[in-house]
């Protein structure tokens, strides 16, 4: 049978040739009648036999972390039959490990980032180097992990590569640090190999630190004639922390928040102060207000670091504006009667400089001939007023400061012009008519009716009457229908067109107002001859019949 | 899982070179006991193995193709390459890589392959 | 070089039926240097049978590999649809080879 023992032939070995052991067959007497050969691969180009004493020899270099075994095949052949001695055999040459090869860490680059203020004993990441050495002979690759550089804040465990915080860190003194590992294998004892990495471990921001304003007094100014809601300056607190945890919200102290606010603007992390509600200087020209400013996120455990808010004065001074005049109402009604004479009361108007100087007031009229005013807002009539022509006026009345032209106010002004009794009743419109010469007594030829232009708080109310000498003439005669109108009858029987072809009525007409007002009104009555079915008329004056809408021939 | 991805030309002209390129994710090619393989297939043939590179740069050619044949190693970018020059079209072939387990010799895996063609 | 010598070249056979491949050596090569590989069109082979005998991860034991020395066997107990493909030996000696390969096609 075969006899040989493991195979083992050291890596990386130099020399030319190398003995790795002997292959023989126990028939071999040691008197060379057998011939050892070798097949496979690797035969003849890496491992070599001695064909006569079946000793193996490796001829070339050999590295175990590329090919760690080889498979051959063994033959022993009888020179002198040719036959084979034992059966074709196959046996194994294992290469040996060397430590040969250093600790790599693989997965480089490393980072890790860890809470600033994290305890002793967190964990920020684990580093791996991988020894492409043989794990299973002796210490080769097994690996100490050690810490070249990053004491005293941090640590790593020897046999896990795991990295520890040693020492509380503070971001706001130190962001990042570079912290070096080394790797060595055979435990770290004499003529190991070494391999490092660098590990960048960023401390991420906690919110440790709370706002604080820079400024113990901020001064502001606003003006007067800001509206609400304007922004009158800014103010700043600094917050050593970063992100969102540098996000601060600003308020004003409950007491202090009437006429001012602080709203916050995220983007920039500024108060802004803005007017709450308008300020007038002649009032109050300054104002004194504390504003307070916090973090917008505080987790609970971070409380402790927040205890007490910052807090700044801020003092606001009211600017001055030359503020327009102030009229006492914000429009005037006068009431005057009409026919007044020119000069005429009609009333007083007053405006006041809101502002300290107290400038005095110059007062007019926009667009008027028919009022004046003077400097001490006396309001007059340049003009009589006739109400019928015009029964209001609407005006404006401005008021400019003497020492400041450009400081204007203007107000309406209603002047309502009262009526009196200045017009007489008169016919609503004018009246023609007529009479047949057949006509009987008593006929009703025609109803007036009047108007007045003036304006009645009662109700108009009109008397009618025919003059003195129509009524003495007793052709027609007239009746008040007690409703404004009146009706004209005839008084006699039978006109004559020839003797007699028209007559002018004089009828008086009263108004009820005080003093009463008359007017005479003429009635124009042409005599027809009227034909005896009423229909063919023939008068003085063709045109009142085809006026009126009657057939002529 | 280590996966292999071949990259280069589809087309290549008569006595130029060919060059692929062989893209290992999902392992390192600094593994030991590894080779890195290029086989390829003739349209309708059998395979043919062209070699092998182990990571330090140590390489293994098929005798037959050993004059006209580089393999190259660049561990930075996890890839090895192939150079066939003078091609003709002979060549014309899909080229698979593939990783060989190097006490063992069985190839596994492999990648996809990519179809050159030696043309002009 | 070692020639890898696969027959036959095309087997006919249907779904549930078995398949005998053989790859004959032209000299011997460890059984712990042979391969089996299956091909389907258009896809890259992949490891069946290594180490003469050992399935590899994933491979159905309906597969099964054996022999030594020059004359090695992949069977397949009962074909599924799914294995009609090219199946190619590979030994690892000096330097490596693959066989022609052996095609089974329906029947």
């Known amino acids: 049978g075969w006899v040989w023992n493991q195979f083992f032939v050291p890596e990386e070995m130099n020399t030319t040739s190398h003995h790795i052991g002997q292959l023989r067959s126990d028939l071999d007497n040691g008197n060379n009648s057998f011939q050892y050969k070798l097949l496979g691969a690797g035969a003849g180009s890496t491992f070599i036999i001695d064909e006569r004493t079946g000793d193996i020899y490796a001829i070339q270099k050999l590295d175990r972390e590329e090919r760690s075994l080889y498979i051959l095949r063994a033959q022993v052949i009888d020179i002198a039959t040719g036959r084979a001695v034992e059966p074709e055999s196959e046996f194994v040459i294992k290469v040996s490990d060397i430590n040969d090869n250093e600790p790599k860490f693989l997965d480089e680059p490393y980072e890790a980032i860890v809470p600033e203020m994290s305890p002793e004993g967190t964990l920020v990441i684990q580093v791996t180097a991988s020894d492409a050495d043989d794990p299973s002979s002796g210490n080769n690759a097994r690996l100490l992990y050690s810490l070249l550089q990053g004491q005293p804040y941090f640590s790593v465990e020897p046999t896990t590569g795991v990295i520890r915080i040693s020492s509380k860190m503070d971001r706001e003194l130190q962001d990042e640090y570079w912290v070096i590992i080394q790797a060595k294998d055979m435990i770290g004892q004499p003529g190991a190999l070494s391999g490092t990495t660098s590990v960048l471990i960023k401390l991420s921001d906690v919110n440790d630190n709370k706002p604080i304003f820079k400024e113990s007094l901020y001064r502001l100014t606003v003006s007067e004639s800001a509206p609400t809601g304007t922004s009158i300056g800014t103010i700043m607190a600094y917050d050593n922390d970063i992100g969102e945890n540098a996000e601060m919200d600003y308020s004003i102290e409950e007491d202090d928040s009437q006429t001012f606010d602080i709203i916050t603007n995220h983007e920039t992390q500024e108060g802004i102060v803005i007017l709450k509600k308008k300020v007038d200087f002649e009032h109050q020209n300054h104002y004194g207000i504390r504003a307070k400013v916090k973090n917008h996120h505080v987790p609970e455990q971070l409380m402790k670091y927040h205890t007490e808010a910052s807090t700044t004065f801020i003092k606001i001074q009211v600017e001055d504006v030359d503020e327009p005049p102030l009229f006492l109402l914000p429009y005037y009604v006068f009431e005057v009667f009409e026919e007044t004479p020119q000069g005429s009361f009609v009333g007083v108007v007053s405006a006041t400089d809101p502002d300290n100087r107290k400038s005095p007031i110059r007062y007019s009229i926009t667009r008027s001939k028919v009022f004046n005013i003077n400097d001490n807002g006396t309001i007059t009539t340049s003009n009589s007023l006739d109400r019928e022509i015009s029964a209001w006026y609407n005006l404006s009345i401005t008021a400019t400061e003497k020492y400041n032209i450009e400081q204007i106010s203007s107000i309406p002004l209603y002047v309502q012009v009262l009526n009196i009794n200045d017009h007489a009743p008169e016919f609503s419109q004018y009246y023609e008519t007529y009479v047949c010469e057949n006509a009987g007594s008593g006929q009703v030829i025609q109803t007036i009716s009047a108007v007045d232009r003036d304006e009645s708080i009662e109700e108009h109310h009109f008397y009618f009457n025919l003059s003195v000498e129509d009524t003495n003439n007793s052709s027609f005669t007239i009746i008040d229908n007690q409703d404004n109108t009146a009706v004209i009858l005839t008084n006699r029987t039978g006109f004559n067109l020839q003797e007699e072809p028209v007559f002018y009525i004089s009828i008086l007409i009263a108004d009820n107002g005080i003093p009463s007002l008359t007017s005479t009104n003429t009635l124009t009555i042409h005599v027809c001859d009227c034909g005896d079915s009423g229909s063919t008329q023939t008068c003085q004056y063709q045109e009142l019949v085809l006026s009126m809408g009657f057939k002529t021939e | 899982q280590v996966q292999l991805q071949e990259s280069g030309p589809g087309l290549v002209k008569p006595s130029q070179t060919l060059s692929l390129t062989c893209t290992i994710s999902?392992?390192?090619?600094?593994?030991?006991?590894?080779?890195w393989s290029w086989i390829r297939q003739h349209p309708g043939k059998g395979l043919e193995w062209i070699g092998y590179?182990?990571?330090?740069?140590?390489?293994y050619y098929n005798p037959s193709l050993k004059s006209r044949v580089t393999i190259s190693v660049d561990t930075s970018k996890n890839q090895f390459s192939l150079k066939l020059t003078s091609v003709t079209a002979a060549d014309t072939a899909v080229y698979y890589c593939a990783r060989v387990n190097s006490n063992y010799g069985w190839f596994d895996p492999w990648g996809q392959g990519t179809l050159v063609t030696v043309s002009s | 070089e070692i020639v890898l010598t696969q027959s036959p070249g095309t087997l006919s056979l249907s779904p549930g039926e078995r398949a005998t491949l053989s790859c004959r050596a032209s000299?011997?090569?460890?059984?712990?240097?042979l391969a089996w590989y299956q091909q389907k069109p258009g896809q890259a082979p992949r490891l069946l049978i290594y180490?003469?005998?050992s399935r590899a991860t994933g491979i159905p034991d309906r597969f099964s590999g054996s022999g030594s020395g020059t004359d090695f066997t992949l069977t397949i107990s009962r074909l599924e649809p799914e294995d009609f493909a090219v199946y190619y030996c590979q030994q690892y000696g000096s330097s490596p080879t693959f066989g022609g390969g052996t095609k089974v096609e329906i029947k």
């Open positions: 000299q011997s090569v460890s059984s712990s240097y």
């Open positions: 590179i182990f990571y330090s740069g140590r390489t």
């Open positions: 999902g392992g390192s090619i600094s593994s030991g006991g590894y080779y």
């Open positions: 180490g003469a005998s």
